[in-house]
Interface confidence: medium
């Protein structure tokens, strides 16, 4: 009969009494307090709330709670030669001038030290010269402008709107495309919601509000001067100019007020279809340059941050397990703010904070996890992911060996409409059963489960009476955990409705207005949002620290490998003379995801039946499903991007948020009909599908019987 | 380990009703699924209901649907069987099972691996 020896307890710790432990009221307090100040990374402040959470989880029962620190490169504005953006007229002198900062919001007028809206990383310069408006700078944009309506990007300035892909893809197509500068700008048809106010009254953006980020492409990197290793007192750092991931324009964001302004006068092309409109009272013209009038004003940008090397911390809480100490269950998220952080990272912050608390009471009465569970709270990841990344350089050799899962806690919030869970398919089964556990906190579901709401307002586009769960893309602190290092991941946030809601993300995004009275008034007064947030990833982490045999189902992975194997046939079918031409066969990825799929299926027949009260066959099996996920590493990693190595799935490399599957295939065959030589593009097709081949047939063996 | 203990059985008349109790010690910790199998005579094992441990989940087998309730306390660590309009193929030895797998396809499904109570007879007889 199965046993359970990690506890020798009252019949009371269990995962109800974790959930039941849970307090919204509690949220709501840690978060008010976590926003109150600004916590920029490598700023004092941040390093207090660093020490206070360190103090405050060893109050509440962890066995140990450290800080780690790196020495990293971050990005600063110059507090006495502030951006701007002008326009100037043809003697030079300016005749308009961006903002240099947004009005604070109520109550916050005498904060010192909230940083004006930069993009962080960008090098100095004073570009001047006409503007090209090129819609969201997604690749596809640049497709159109280049090659459609022959419009030539080189020494031009580019105005870009924000939303649809990650803003470091946005300046990387742009310097691709020739231009010396990048001014990017929120436009009401992406950040303000219709039948909504602005803030303080709304949860809008107001045209003053700006939205901050850091622009580089590290693919994974970590800290820019020292790739694949931590930034540590020892560390050899590259030169600047030989830094991962650095724009070489100069980048700024503005408002919609400020855009207005620039675009009003634009002349030149019209837009080439509807698309390219935003809400703005103003043409949309393409450009280049000003219309007739204005035809001899040009757009001078002024840019003076720094890059400095500055010290950050994590803090690293744990709690030790009583069977299998060398097992690790992580729960990480972000402590770092670009202002007050309301939303972005403290409403995910304040949970974290809470599944602590009710870890520790749980600890204090006896009980402890089965395996260790592991309590991150990262630094600097809106630089970059620099934190999460730097310690998992440090501690991979622990990690790949020991690593079972990572649970990642940003934003708990990006609304209130439903859940919204990306993850690994080894998690779908136990996101799913816990789901139908949980009491759904929606209005019109009382009573029902949280399942229930979720699949009914987000249904799976393929299977009826299922939730939709969505790849893991990148933009945040599980990348080097499943992205790098093959550890499964999942993230949990309650989300808007993408259907009425076609915004990118949430208006008030990385503005100054993100504040504790955005979430308490306007997002989720009774903090029951929260609440269920805490309950998805807490409990998650519970089973997944606690369960006899790990609650991972390999079926789902064979499942979803046939899906991602037929939709990447499907892309190549588009070619059908060249691959016939140049003998371009997927059998071997289909023979593959075919064996996956019946060794799969044997392994979790065995999984039903095997002796559970035998500890080396209890190991020996949880094993085989801990590195399953490390089976889809390739050491070598994907072409061009060394440290996104998972063969599944990597983030796009046309938007660093989404997640791709088969990457390797798809950038192979993208835009492969433009390629100079079809014979080469067509070779790296054939190389791509050999390697994906191989790893899904590598992978299937691990869950083999052993001998 | 996991001890289940059922009462409640006996003797009654069809269409009358029984209440059965299983009550759980050991430990219970990290049990997720309880529920009911029965066996008849010279028949094979047969799932009757379980519930999850949150209660929001509950399944009846068809046989026994719109007249056997599942109800389960958490607090007392008992899960309880309500047994209206009692019918002669409902006799049985009627067995508490519980469950630690939160995450199968089949949370219901109870084998071998699970603990298992020794069983209370349910005889309907007129």
């Known amino acids: 009969k199965s046993s359970n020896e990690a506890t020798n307890i009252t019949p009371k710790h269990n995962m109800k009494a974790f959930l039941d432990e849970l307090k919204a009221e509690n949220i709501k307090k840690f978060l008010y307090n976590f926003t109150q100040i600004p916590h920029l990374a490598g700023t004092e402040q941040n390093f207090q709330l660093a020490k206070q959470i360190q103090s405050q989880w060893k109050e509440f029962g962890l066995d140990s709670v450290e800080l780690a620190h790196y020495d990293v490169l971050l990005s600063y504005p110059n507090k006495t030669h502030p951006n701007y953006i002008s326009i100037i007229n043809e003697d030079g002198n300016e005749i308009f001038n961006t903002s240099l900062f947004e009005p604070p919001p109520p109550g916050y007028e005498n904060v010192s030290d909230i940083v004006p809206p930069f993009s962080a990383f960008s090098p100095q310069g004073m570009p001047e010269g006409d503007l090209v408006y090129v819609n969201y700078a997604r690749t596809e944009d640049f497709f159109k402008l280049e090659r459609d309506m022959k419009i030539n990007c080189s020494g031009k300035i580019v105005i870009a709107r924000y939303g649809k892909v990650f803003r470091g893809n946005k300046v990387k197509n742009a310097q691709l495309a020739g231009a010396k500068g990048v001014i990017l700008y929120s436009d009401p048809a992406d950040y303000f919601a219709p039948g909504v106010k602005s803030y303080p009254d709304g949860w809008n953006l107001p045209g003053g509000g700006v939205q901050r980020g850091n622009i580089l492409n590290l693919n994974g990197a970590g800290d820019p001067l020292t790739p694949g290793y931590p930034a540590n007192e020892y560390a050899y750092r590259r030169g600047i100019a030989e830094a991962v991931g650095l724009p070489s324009i100069p980048v700024h964001p503005i408002g919609y007020y400020d855009a207005q302004k620039l675009l009003e006068k634009m002349g030149g092309s019209a837009p080439p279809d509807s698309s390219w409109r935003g809400s703005l009272k103003v043409p949309y013209n393409v450009g280049p340059g000003f219309t007739g009038n204005f035809s001899t004003q040009k757009v001078k940008m002024h840019i003076h941050s720094t890059n400095e090397v500055t010290r950050i911390y994590n803090v690293i809480g744990t709690l030790r397990g009583a069977v299998e100490p060398d097992r690790y269950v992580i729960l990480g998220g972000h402590r770092d703010s670009w202002v007050f952080g309301g939303i972005d990272p403290q409403s995910g912050a304040a949970v974290v904070h809470e599944i602590v608390r009710s870890f520790g009471t749980l600890k204090k009465e006896g009980w402890r996890p089965r395996r260790t569970i592991l309590f991150a709270s990262w630094d600097a990841e809106e630089f970059g992911l620099l934190g999460s990344t730097e310690w998992a350089e440090e501690n991979s050799r622990l990690l790949q060996e020991r690593g079972v899962a990572y649970i990642n806690a940003d934003s708990s919030i990006e609304g209130n409409y439903t859940l919204r869970v990306d993850c690994t398919p080894l998690m779908y089964s136990l996101v799913h059963n816990l789901t139908k556990e949980l009491k759904s906190p929606d209005e019109g579901f009382e009573g029902k489960s949280l399942y229930e709401s979720w699949t009914k307002k987000s249904p799976s586009p393929e299977f009826s009476g299922m939730p939709r769960i969505s790849k893991l893309g990148s933009g945040n602190d599980f990348e080097v955990f499943f992205q790098r290092l093959g550890i499964a991941s999942g993230r949990a946030r309650y989300t808007k409705n993408w259907e009425t809601n076609k915004f990118s993300g949430y208006p008030l995004y990385h503005s100054v207005y993100e504040t504790y009275e955005l979430v308490e008034k306007f997002y989720d007064p009774m903090f029951k949002y929260h609440l269920t947030v805490a309950q998805v990833r807490g409990g998650m982490v519970f089973e997944l620290a606690n369960s006899i045999v790990l609650p991972f189902d390999c079926r789902d992975y064979a499942v979803v490998l046939r899906k991602y194997a037929d939709k990447i046939y499907s892309i190549s079918m588009k070619h059908p003379q060249e691959m016939k031409t140049y003998s371009v066969s997927f059998d071997s990825l289909f023979s593959a995801v075919k064996n996956f799929t019946e060794i799969a299926s044997k392994f979790s027949e065995r999984l039903q039946d095997f002796d559970k009260s035998n500890p080396i066959v209890l190991r020996m099996m949880n094993d085989q499903l801990m590195f399953l996920e490390r089976a889809f590493i390739d050491p070598l990693g994907l072409p061009d991007r060394p440290f996104y190595r998972h063969v599944i799935y990597a983030p796009s490399s046309h938007n660093k948020y989404a997640g791709e599957s088969f990457p390797g295939i798809y950038d192979a065959l993208f835009d492969i009909e433009s390629k100079v030589d079809p014979s080469k593009a067509w070779g790296e097709v054939k190389r791509q599908i050999y390697v994906a081949a191989f790893t899904v047939q590598a992978a299937a063996e691990t869950l083999s019987e052993v001998a | 380990q996991v001890q289940l203990v059922e009462s409640g059985g006996g003797v009654v008349q069809p269409g009358r009703s029984l209440r059965l109790s299983c009550a759980a010690s050991?430990?219970?910790?990290?049990?997720?699924?309880m529920g009911w199998v029965r066996q008849a005579p010279g028949k094979e094992r047969e799932f009757v209901a379980a519930?999850?441990?949150?209660?929001?989940?509950?399944l009846v087998s068809d046989s026994v649907k719109g007249r056997f309730t599942i109800s389960r306390d958490n607090s007392k660590n008992t899960l309880y069987l309500q047994m209206n309009s009692l019918r002669a193929e409902d006799t049985a030895v009627y067995y508490c099972a519980a469950s630690n797998r939160l995450y199968g396809r089949t949370w219901y499904d109870f084998n071998e691996s699970d603990y298992w109570g020794q069983g209370t007879q349910v005889t309907v007889s007129s």
């Open positions: 519930i999850s441990w949150s209660g929001l989940n509950r």
């Open positions: 050991g430990r219970t910790f990290g049990i997720y699924v």
